[in-house]
Interface confidence: low
């Protein structure tokens, strides 16, 4: 840093004073010098460094009529909105005759009520769950001691006694307010008041109680909700996207979920109007007067297969001598699962019913025993899944084959010997 030389007497007749104040204060430092000849430009130093962008004004007053007479020069440095960065030692600096002269120092200090660098923030927490709050304040003057308050009640016996920048709260059972007081030699500043809203804990142990093709009954264990009773729980179900799109922690489903509300207790819900034999993901959240818990992770579940809801369609049955040809089409009604095949039953008047498993084919040729003179022969067909048989079709009478009718080529199915019936 520049320094004055002892070769000449200092031109300074007035040195900067001292300023001590609180943040935001506006003040002025002033120095005055008397010089002969052309007035020099006055610069300002802070802690030995030239302030290149100083907010300073310089006033020059001649003491005589000649330019070479003495001049009084006054430089004023304005400090607006005092900050910590403004503090330090201030001096005026002039260059006179190739010599540097520096005034005596003045000092700018920051001293006032504590200033918050960080204050507690509003947040939501699950009941009885630990969390931390932060508060940070500075002077000067230091030290700054913090005192935390919960619902306006101090958490320590005196400022500085107890946690300082970070308050660890082991858990709350009711919505509470927290603030911190910052104390120093000048007094006390109080932070904003943070509201910590206590929400229910995430429900646990979401599981299936029972399954039907179009409904699932699920149950869960509620989490703690503090002093606030749960008002309801909300269950969401979404079609699984072949395992894609919903990961364990994904916050939102890939499509609009089916949402149901459950009164509690009991913590159980029957979720209806589902598709049979379909994978879903489900999750649950519970709500108190303070708000909802977080959702559980998505739980993969699946509705079981059901039986087909309708019989095969367009059944036709024709007879030609000792053979009968039957064909049909897949049911139009929902299968509620994977079609495993068809069952066929035929029966004549006063004869026992014959039941056959046709598999997945949609036609069959029956080799009838006897001369084929049995009367009122009827055929019924049903589709089946792993869950069982769907409804049987209405009995279709076996019509005599007329010449000109197509006779499809197909595998002949020999009627089983037992049970069987024959015509005399």
């Amino acid at each position: 840093a520049p320094r004055g030389t002892q070769a000449e007497e200092s031109p300074f007749v007035g040195n900067p004073g001292n300023i001590t104040g609180a943040r935001g204060l506006t003040g002025t430092l002033r120095c005055q010098l008397q010089v002969q000849g052309e007035p020099p430009e006055v610069h300002w130093l802070r802690d030995g460094q030239i302030l290149e962008l100083a907010d300073s004004t310089q006033t020059q007053v001649p003491l005589g009529e000649d330019e070479q007479d003495d001049w009084i020069v006054v430089s004023q440095l304005r400090i607006t909105s005092l900050q910590l960065s403004d503090t330090g030692q201030y001096q005026c600096l002039v260059f006179l005759g190739h010599q540097t002269f520096v005034s005596q120092p003045g000092y700018v200090g920051l001293e006032g009520l504590p200033y918050f660098l960080e204050e507690p923030e509003d947040r939501t927490v699950a009941a009885n769950t630990p969390f931390n709050l932060s508060c940070q304040a500075q002077g000067p003057p230091e030290p700054v001691d913090l005192l935390w308050l919960q619902d306006a009640v101090p958490l320590a016996t005196a400022p500085g006694h107890g946690p300082q920048r970070s308050l660890h709260v082991p858990g709350l059972n009711k919505t509470s307010s927290f603030s911190c007081e910052a104390h120093n030699a000048k007094g006390v500043t109080t932070s904003r008041t943070a509201t910590i809203t206590v929400l229910p804990q995430q429900p646990r142990n979401l599981h299936l109680v029972s399954r039907q093709p179009t409904e699932l009954e699920v149950a869960w264990t509620p989490g703690l909700s503090g002093i606030y009773p749960l008002t309801h729980c909300t269950l969401q179900a979404v079609l699984s996207d072949d395992g894609m799109g919903i990961q364990a922690g994904e916050p939102d489903p890939p499509e609009e979920p089916l949402t149901s509300q459950a009164s509690v207790p009991p913590h159980q819900l029957r979720l209806g109007s589902l598709h049979p034999h379909t994978p879903y993901h489900i999750r649950v959240a519970c709500t108190s007067s303070q708000g909802p818990s977080s959702w559980t992770h998505w739980l993969p579940v699946e509705t079981p297969e059901g039986v087909p809801l309708g019989p095969p369609e367009n059944i036709s049955a024709t007879r030609n001598g000792s053979q009968a040809f039957v064909h049909w089409q897949e049911p139009r009604a929902p299968l509620q699962g994977t079609l495993l095949g068809y069952r066929l039953a035929y029966q004549g008047q006063d004869t026992p019913e014959v039941l056959m498993d046709i598999g997945l084919r949609q036609e069959v040729t029956l080799e009838l025993q006897g001369d084929g003179s049995v009367s009122n022969l009827t055929v019924c067909v049903a589709a089946y899944t792993a869950a069982g048989d769907g409804p049987w079709s209405l009995p279709v009478p076996l019509e005599a084959w007329r010449p000109g009718q197509a006779q499809p080529v197909h595998q002949l199915v020999k009627e089983p010997s037992t049970p069987a019936f024959s015509w005399p």
Partner: antibody, heavy 117, light 107 residues
Framework: EVNLVESGGGLVQPGGSLKLSCATS????????MYWVRQTPEKRLEWVAY????????YYPDTVKGRFTISRDNAKNTLYLQMSRLKSEDTAMYYC??????????WGQGTSVTVSS | DIVMTQSHKFMSTSVGDRVSITCKAS??????VAWYQQKPGQSPKLLIY???TRHTGVPDRFTGSGSGTDYTLTISSVQAEDLALYYC?????????FGSGTKLEIK
């Protein structure tokens, strides 16, 4: 994991001096007030000194006031205890400890100080 | 200075028993009381602060209670590993003072 490790203890003559150190890790040292506590050979625990998180406030009981000085270097995460004009009754295991609600939630393993001629 | 008195220097108990260790302050300390456990060859460990708040990781068989001048540390079902010295401390006013300790012995 919070860890406090004391060092600097040893045998010293009455009237002598000793400086204890406590190196810390696993937590933000500058956020916490710190303690020195000692345990006499008879297993009595005595509070020796404490210092505020910024180092601006220090407190001592009358038994050590004027002889012991607590200090800290937040840049080095280290706590110190400068002991001078030691007496035989200062013989003890010296522990540094972290303050939590003004209780000591973590302690070091201790360093032994013996004052004897 | 506030004096913390632990009247029992020794207490003998059996595994599974319930035991209560008491501490009396010479003046009201407004529940600013901590309890420490010191096992042989180890440094003290914090169990309870503010009279009844259990420190992180402390088994729930340890509970603290009391107000005014009388405070109690209760172990609901003593385990073999609970053999130790137990100290109370007031953190109400400087100088912070400790009780003289109660040694828990397992029969």
């Amino acid at each position: 994991e919070v860890n406090l490790v004391e060092s600097g203890g040893g045998l010293v003559q009455p009237g002598g001096s000793l400086k204890l150190s406590c190196a810390t890790s696993g937590f933000t040292f500058s956020d916490y007030y710190m303690y020195w506590v000692r345990q006499t050979p008879e297993k009595r625990l005595e509070w020796v000194a404490y210092i505020s998180n910024g180092g601006g406030s220090t407190y001592y009981p009358d038994t050590v006031k004027g002889r012991f000085t607590i200090s800290r270097d937040n840049a080095k995460n280290t706590l110190y205890l400068q002991m001078s004009r030691l007496k035989s009754e200062d013989t003890a295991m010296y522990y540094c400890a972290r303050l939590h609600f003004y209780a000591m939630d973590y302690w070091g393993q201790g360093t032994s100080v013996t004052v004897s001629s | 200075d506030i004096v913390m008195t632990q009247s029992h220097k020794f207490m003998s108990t059996s595994v599974g028993d319930r035991v209560s260790i008491t501490c009396k302050a010479s003046q009201d300390v407004s529940t600013a009381v901590a309890w420490y456990q010191q096992k042989p060859g180890q440094s003290p460990k914090l169990l309870i602060y503010w009279a009844s708040t259990r420190h992180t990781g402390v088994p729930d068989r340890f509970t603290g209670s009391g107000s005014g001048t009388d405070y109690t540390l209760t172990i609901s079902s003593v385990q073999a590993e609970d053999l130790a010295l137990y100290y109370c401390q007031q953190h109400y006013n400087t100088p912070f003072t400790f009780g003289s300790g109660t040694k828990l012995e397992i029969k």
